[in-house]
Interface confidence: low
Amino acid sequence: VPRWRQQWSGPGTTKRFPETVLARCVKYTEIHPEMRHVDCQSVWDAFKGAFISKHPCNITEEDYQPLMKLGTQTVPCNKILLWSRIKDLAHQFTQVQRDMFTLEDTLLGYLADDLTWCGEFNTSKINYQSCPDWRKDCSNNPVSVFWKTVSRRFAEAACDVVHVMLNGSRSKIFDKNSTFGSVEVHNLQPEKVQTLEAWVIHGGREDSRDLCQDPTIKELESIISKRNIQFSCKNIYRPDKFLQCVKNPEDSSCTSEI
């Protein structure tokens, strides 16, 4: 007789989740010599231990601590790029500007990027049918708690000038409910971080407005200033040209504003 299984509102665990995590770990540790000491089987065991046999609406940051410890990594604290609602461009940028890092350029972020996972209370099974949705079901689900934990730690790690890429095409360029707005902004350490510099990425070809004057950017500035961190903002009017100029800064067309 098939067991009754909780139906959640979100998609289920990504197909071949254990194999994907393990394969990503092996690939990452091969590419990054400083992480060659990492035992990927132990990483998977710690990852699994965070959510297997636990109610998927009752996950805590403590559940992920063994994984956090195993995934400890050295990233230059003054080379951190945060992003909100514009992941692809942020990742394209760090692929070119190799000395800057998004969370997904770290081992833990790389392992979990674009994956979904959850288990079931009191069974060792992974739930491939459905997982809790953050809004419709619960916020303390395995995926949300994971990203909250690693995002908090990543923000805590930052120092000097921290950059954030924001999507200028959205109605809320800065969204207080995003991971950046709800976690990262509040965990930058004022004694270490001098400035948060926002890069507002324009979508339209003919859009020459100063999106740094947008009310939500002013709201971000206010939050940051109250935390004794300086704020600066730049419009990236042509993201395609921006990336091109990061690749080839000597190009004569790159001396004008991008």
């Epitope: 050295t74 990233v75 230059p76 604290c77 003054n78 730690r153 790690a157 270490k192």
Partner: antibody, heavy 123, light 107 residues
Framework: QVQLVQSGAEVKKPGSSVKVSCKAS????????IGWVRQAPGQGLEWMGR????????HYAQKFQGRVTITADESTSTAYMELSSLRSEDTAVYYC????????????????WGQGTLVTVSS | EIVMTQSPATLSVSPGERATLSCRAS??????LAWYQQKPGQAPRLLIY???TRATGIPARFSGSGSGTEFTLTISSLQSEDFAVYYC?????????FGQGTKVEIK
């Protein structure tokens, strides 16, 4: 303002060990890295290793691997550097220094230094 | 490990003059370079980090430049308290390494 206060000068016999302490006062300790650097008389500066207390994670320069142990006690905000199998060439001033270290990254530049501890190795 | 080479070993300068110290890395260290000043009997003092950013409380006469493998520390107008030994240090790759130092002495 954070200050790093080191233990006093030591005179040691060859083959013995020395343990130098470095206490942080006036600020947080755990969220930083503590690095150890030595300077032989009339010579330049040489990295030995570093620890991030919150992780209890130490890294050592190859030259000192196996001979140096760096530890930290968060409850007393004190870091320790123990060097074993001492020889006359280990006669030097040993400095601890604070770097910005936290979870994901290694410390980098060092903004606050202890006053130094002279260790003399002589038979 | 990355070898840091400083030149000259000794620089003789008169007070009020400009001093230019060089530091070369055996491979690229990006901008992950710091400069320290050390006076006899004292611990090193951080002057510059990130190759060009002055540390808190450091006078504007100290400036750093360069990236990759070639770096320069410039003291625009030497004061009596600036006569000391200066070290560069890379923190791009572990083990971090110092240059052998440049002694700035009174001419």
């Amino acid at each position: 303002q954070v200050q790093l206060v080191q233990s006093g000068a030591e005179v040691k016999k060859p083959g013995s060990s020395v343990k130098v302490s470095c206490k942080a006062s006036g600020g947080s300790f755990s969220n930083y890295a503590i690095g150890w650097v030595r300077q032989a008389p009339g010579q330049g500066l040489e990295w030995m290793g570093r620890i991030i207390p919150v992780l209890d994670a130490a890294h050592y320069a190859q030259k000192f691997q196996g001979r140096v142990t760096i530890t930290a006690d968060e409850s007393t905000s004190t870091a320790y550097m123990e060097l074993s199998s001492l020889r006359s060439e280990d006669t030097a001033v040993y400095y601890c220094a604070r770097g910005l270290g936290y979870y994901l990254y290694s410390s980098y530049y060092f903004d606050i230094w202890g006053q130094g501890t002279l260790v003399t190795v002589s038979s | 490990e990355i070898v840091m080479t400083q030149s000259p070993a000794t620089l003789s300068v008169s007070p009020g003059e400009r001093a230019t110290l060089s530091c070369r890395a055996s491979q690229s260290v990006s901008s992950n370079l710091a400069w320290y000043q050390q006076k006899p009997g004292q611990a090193p003092r951080l002057l510059i980090y990130g190759a060009s950013t002055r540390a808190t409380g450091i006078p504007a006469r100290f400036s750093g430049s360069g990236s990759g493998t070639e770096f320069t520390l410039t003291i625009s107008s030497l004061q009596s308290e600036d006569f000391a030994v200066y070290y560069c240090q890379q923190y791009n790759n572990w083990p971090w390494t110092f240059g052998q130092g440049t002694k700035v002495e009174i001419k």
